[in-house]
């Protein structure tokens, strides 16, 4: 099943390499112009 993990900072993840992009939850995408 799909998960919504991976929204925290890489530095807080316990494994040596989580493989996850930062994916910050407060980021917003500019509308395409």
């Amino acid at each position: 099943s799909e998960t919504t993990t991976g929204t925290s900072s890489n530095s807080s993840q316990s494994t040596s390499n989580s493989g996850l992009a930062p994916n910050p939850t407060n980021a917003t995408t500019k509308a395409a112009g």
């Epitope: 530095s11 930062p22 980021a27 995408t29």
Partner: antibody
Amino acid sequence: QVTLKESGPALVKPTQTLTLTCTVTGYSITSGYTVSWIRQPPGKALEWIGYIQYTGSTRYNPSLKTRLTISRDTSKNQFVLTMTNMDPVDTATYYCARGTTASFDYWGQGTTVTVSS
Amino acid sequence: DIQMTQSPSSLSASVGDRVTITCRSSQSLLYSSDQKNYLTWYQQKPGKAPKLLISWASTRASGVPSRFSGSGSGTDFTLTISSLQPEDFATYYCQQYFIYPLTFGGGTKLEIK
């Protein structure tokens, strides 16, 4: 030495389900990292399909989400991509690649899938 | 989704030339928590898988020659090849590794003049 290798059918018919396998050597798939599936239509750019993390959690591209399942077989160190309702626009080379926290550092050789009746 | 725009789409150059490829993102790729830009460059040769060149906008991958360099921050990035070698003729892609879904630029095909 880390290697990834994709395998699966070269030809599928429209509306059929595609199943591809990515076999990993050189590290245990439960030890870290993600593995993503990425595709490239002929002569076009790369498109990220989705990933499965070392924990087994998944994330999919919203544009394909309803058609996708990515799973794993830890005993075989393999990942499986299943894509339903294939269409000719899904004709592409499909890659699996290991994801770090910054990039895809190792890629499979790719497997070409043609969707045609 | 974050849009990644590369320019030019194709480029003719000669061995020994200095070449610059530009990549622009529709949103900043600078992560405030670690002050890193999550922008990656790959090289792809015909019939082959992409090869990692540069991550975090400017960090060369292991084994990548020093003639390849990446720079930029926020939304504007460049890949520079200081002196083209015959093996550098290929297609180059930028990618944002910041927010899902991960997205790639349209590619820049570097051809021999």
